[in-house]
Interface confidence: low
């Protein structure tokens, strides 16, 4: 694959037109010095996209995930 010449955050730009129903799974990347990085694997074509953390359903998902984590 092409190689980057300089380090960059995995997600520098975010897709805001992603339907929750089209997401196979989400990956939250903990990358130092980068904004919140959420990568989705899509159902319809198996591609990966970076999702806008400000999406309403993403916020709800993160809230639930955090609540679960702190209840345990």
């Amino acid at each position: 694959k092409p190689v980057s010449l300089s380090y960059r955050c995995p997600c520098r730009f975010f897709e805001s037109h992603v339907a929750r129903a089209n997401v196979k799974h989400l990956k939250i990347l903990n990358t130092p010095n980068c904004a919140l990085q959420i990568v989705a694997r899509l159902k319809n074509n198996n591609r990966q996209v970076c999702i806008d953390p400000k999406l309403k359903w993403i916020q709800e998902y993160l809230e639930k995930a955090l609540n679960k984590r702190f209840k345990m």
Partner: antibody, heavy 124, light 107 residues
Framework: EVQLVESGRGLVQPGGSLRLSCAAS????????MSWVRQAPGKGLEWVAN????????YYVDSVKGRFTISRDNAKNSLYLQMNSLRAEDTAVYYC?????????????????WGQGTTVTVSS | AIRMTQSPSSVSASVGDRVTITCRAS??????LAWYQQTPGKAPKLLIY???SLESGVPSRFSGSGSGTDFTLTISSLQPEDFATYYC?????????FGQGTKVEIK
């Protein structure tokens, strides 16, 4: 509907200039790399240039370097190709296309959305 | 620049035939290859990306394979709408070069 519409077609004399525009709709334009591809009459496809989402990275085919400039205005959902010092061999149909990239810098999936093309003729 | 060479440059086939088009890169490009279909007067259409992944909405009779320098596009059973010109494109490095095209014609 995801759509790209080119404009700026024209007949130009050798040495002249022309600016092509591409209006995007139906998708988050600012999230995508974008390309220009051309096709001379009766010939195959030739990739011309592309640029990343914020304009910090631009790449060109050698034959247009120093003459063509790719740019974009994310607020207007528009891509541009400024063509200067035009030559007869620049005569072609010019397509703008959406580059499908993944979240990682090395992910690239080809060009999945294309405009209808706009004709540029360079002739005296 | 990486040179992409397609063969054959044209092929005559009948509806129902299996058609194979090959694309060879002048140097290794991993799986960084896409295939496009273009019908006269129309814009190209993405068929295959990453050498073997079928683009969403493309019929399953199209398939791609290969890695490194040798790649293949196969149409398992040619349909009337498949008569067109097919191009490969590498995206391993700049400039992103295309093959010269393969025209699939009616026999």
């Amino acid at each position: 509907e995801v759509q790209l519409v080119e404009s700026g077609r024209g007949l130009v004399q050798p040495g002249g200039s022309l600016r092509l525009s591409c209006a995007a709709s139906g998708f988050t334009f600012s999230s995508y790399w974008m390309s220009w591809v051309r096709q001379a009459p009766g010939k195959g496809l030739e990739w011309v240039a592309n640029m990343n989402q914020d304009g910090s990275e631009k790449y060109y085919v050698d034959s247009v370097k120093g003459r063509f400039t790719i740019s974009r205005d994310n607020a207007k959902n528009s891509l541009y190709l400024q063509m200067n010092s035009l030559r007869a061999e620049d005569t072609a149909v010019y397509y703008c296309a959406r580059d499908l990239t993944g979240p990682y810098y090395y992910d690239y999936y080809g060009m999945d959305v294309w405009g209808q093309g706009t004709t540029v003729t360079v002739s005296s | 620049a990486i040179r992409m060479t397609q063969s054959p440059s044209s092929v005559s086939a009948s509806v129902g035939d299996r058609v194979t088009i090959t694309c060879r890169a002048s140097q290794g490009i991993s799986s960084a290859l896409a295939w496009y279909q273009q019908t006269p007067g129309k814009a190209p259409k993405l068929l295959i990306y990453d050498a073997s992944s079928l683009e969403s909405g493309v019929p399953s009779r199209f398939s791609g394979s290969g890695s490194g320098t040798d790649f293949t596009l196969t149409i398992s059973s040619l349909q009337p709408e498949d008569f067109a010109t097919y191009y490969c494109q590498q995206f391993n490095s700049y400039p992103r070069t295309f093959g010269q095209g393969t025209k699939v014609e009616i026999k």
